[in-house]
């Protein structure tokens, strides 16, 4: 008889994924010569030994604590680009301007892009079948705290500029949910951190307005600065051209608005 | 494999204290997990704690606290403890062992005599 | 603290036979079990942790199975070097503990 398991809302563990996060830890590793110390399986042990036998609804930071020990990685503070519904650009541009860093440019970010993993209580499976679903399930899942746990000791190291980019294509740019907007906003440090420069990124070629005066970067600008940060913003018309420029900075054609 | 080497054998006065050291060639010492370990004839093994040398962290069994003091030089790689206010009871084999789940390279003990 | 029984003290056996040193958790510790091998006058040797999962460079005669309380070491095809004593321990909760320890005689 088939033993009843819970059934959630989400996908499950992608598959092969203990493979996957050992494979991508000794490609990292061998690729960054600053974190050839990092011992990969290690790495697997505290991530497995994070949510593997626990509830997948109670799931916390502290769960993850000897994975965060592991992947203590330095990244010049002054060059973190944080992003909100707009990865594979940000991805795009931190690949082209090498010396700026998304969190998926670090270590423990590299591991978990795109990956969807979770356990069941009391046994060692991990759980294919299904995981739970931030808003149908609960938050508390072991992907959301990852994510949550990470982003947070990421804008907490961030100094003096910090960039934002944003998808100037969504009904709500500064979505407060998001990762950026409950998590990495907040958790900024004021006494580090100068500026907060958000870079709207606009959709249509055609698309001339000033999406720095929309309400939710008011919003986005207002929060801010009641965290002593100034803020600043800028229209990316053109993000075709925009990594271009980033790739070309002499081409002529880039001395103009973007 | 490598080596976690610990000095030889310690003869100490009962209330007096001593610091054994447990030095590795390993590169990865910052991020791994460094448990003491105690044996004593015919009592198997007992978890005193551990340290993470890469930002000092320590988690002690409740029955070593005030006991024992772990900590750890990155620079030279070698991780220490103290022992305090011995008494014969503390007359044991002491190991270092790398590891958090399970440990997987053991130092070879010291063994430590409190005798007056 | 949990506590983890190794109820025969003693076991013995002869090379070639098959052996199975057994682990009981007075707790549910999952899978979070190493087991070590100690040979006389020498430090510990980790065999197999997460209750199942073979150390680097550790002959596979020895394997290690279970999950919850109950948990078993099995060494096959046993050889005279296999004389030794060997520990559980449970790595789930704090502290760390390990079992009191069986010694593999050799007939």
């Known amino acids: 008889v088939p033993r009843w398991r819970q059934q959630w809302s989400g996908p499950g563990t992608t598959k092969r994924f203990p493979e996957t996060v050992l494979a991508r830890c000794v490609k990292y590793t061998e690729i960054h010569p600053e974190m050839r110390h990092v011992d990969c399986q290690s790495v697997w042990d505290a991530f497995k030994g994070a949510f593997i036998s626990k509830h997948p609804c109670n799931i916390t930071e502290e769960d993850y604590q000897p994975l965060m020990k592991l992947g203590t990685q330095t990244v010049p503070c002054n060059k973190i680009l944080l992003w909100s519904r707009i990865k594979d650009l940000a991805h795009q541009f931190t690949q082209v301007q090498r010396d700026m860093f998304t969190l998926e440019d670090t270590l423990l970010g590299y591991l978990a892009d795109d990956l969807t993993w979770c356990g069941e209580f009391n046994t060692s499976k991990i759980n294919y079948q299904s995981c739970p679903d931030w808003r149908k399930d609960c938050s508390n899942n072991p992907v959301s705290v990852f994510w949550k746990t990470v982003s947070r000791r990421f804008a907490e190291a961030a100094c003096d500029v910090v960039h934002v980019m944003l998808n100037g294509s969504r009904s709500k740019i500064f979505d407060k949910n998001s990762t950026f907007g409950s998590v990495e906003v907040h958790n900024l440090q004021p006494e580090k951190v100068q500026t907060l420069e958000a870079w709207v990124i606009h959709g249509g070629r055609e698309d001339s307005r000033d999406l720095c005066q929309d309400p939710t970067i008011k919003e986005l600008e207002s929060i801010i600065s009641k965290r002593n940060i100034q803020f600043s913003c800028k229209n990316i018309y053109r993000p075709d051209k925009f990594l271009q420029c980033v790739k070309n900075p002499e081409d002529s054609s880039c001395t103009s608005e973007i | 494999q490598v080596q976690l080497q610990q000095p030889g054998p310690e003869l100490v006065k009962p209330v007096a204290s001593v610091k054994i050291s447990c030095k590795t060639s390993?590169?990865?010492?910052?991020?791994?997990?460094m448990n003491w370990v105690k044996q004593r004839p015919g009592k198997g093994l007992e978890w005193i704690g551990w340290?993470?040398?890469?930002?000092?962290?320590?988690n002690y069994n409740g029955k070593f606290k005030g006991k024992a003091t772990l900590t750890a030089d990155k620079s030279s790689s070698t991780a220490y403890m103290q022992l305090s206010s011995l008494t014969s009871e503390d007359s044991a084999v002491y190991f270092c062992?790398?590891?958090?789940?399970?440990?997987?390279?053991w130092g070879q003990g010291t063994s430590v005599t409190v005798s007056s | 603290d949990i506590v983890m029984t190794q109820s025969h003290k003693f076991m013995s056996t002869s090379v070639g036979d098959r052996v199975s040193i057994t682990c009981k958790a007075s707790?549910?510790?999952?899978?979070?079990v190493a087991w070590y091998q100690q040979k006389p006058g020498q430090s510990p040797k980790l065999l197999i942790y997460?209750?199942?999962s073979r150390h680097t460079g550790v002959p596979d005669r020895f394997t290690g199975s279970g999950s919850g309380t109950d948990f078993t070491l099995t060494i096959s095809n046993v050889q005279s070097e296999d004389l030794a004593d060997y520990f559980c321990?449970?790595?789930?909760?704090?502290?760390?503990?390990f079992g009191s320890g069986t010694k593999l005689e050799i007939k």
């Open positions: 340290i993470y040398p890469g930002d000092g962290d320590t």
């Open positions: 062992a790398r590891g958090r789940w399970g440990m997987d390279n």
């Open positions: 707790q549910n510790v999952v899978t979070a």
């Open positions: 390993d590169y990865a010492f910052s991020s791994s997990w």
């Open positions: 997460w209750a199942s």
């Open positions: 321990q449970q790595y789930s909760n704090y502290p760390f503990t």
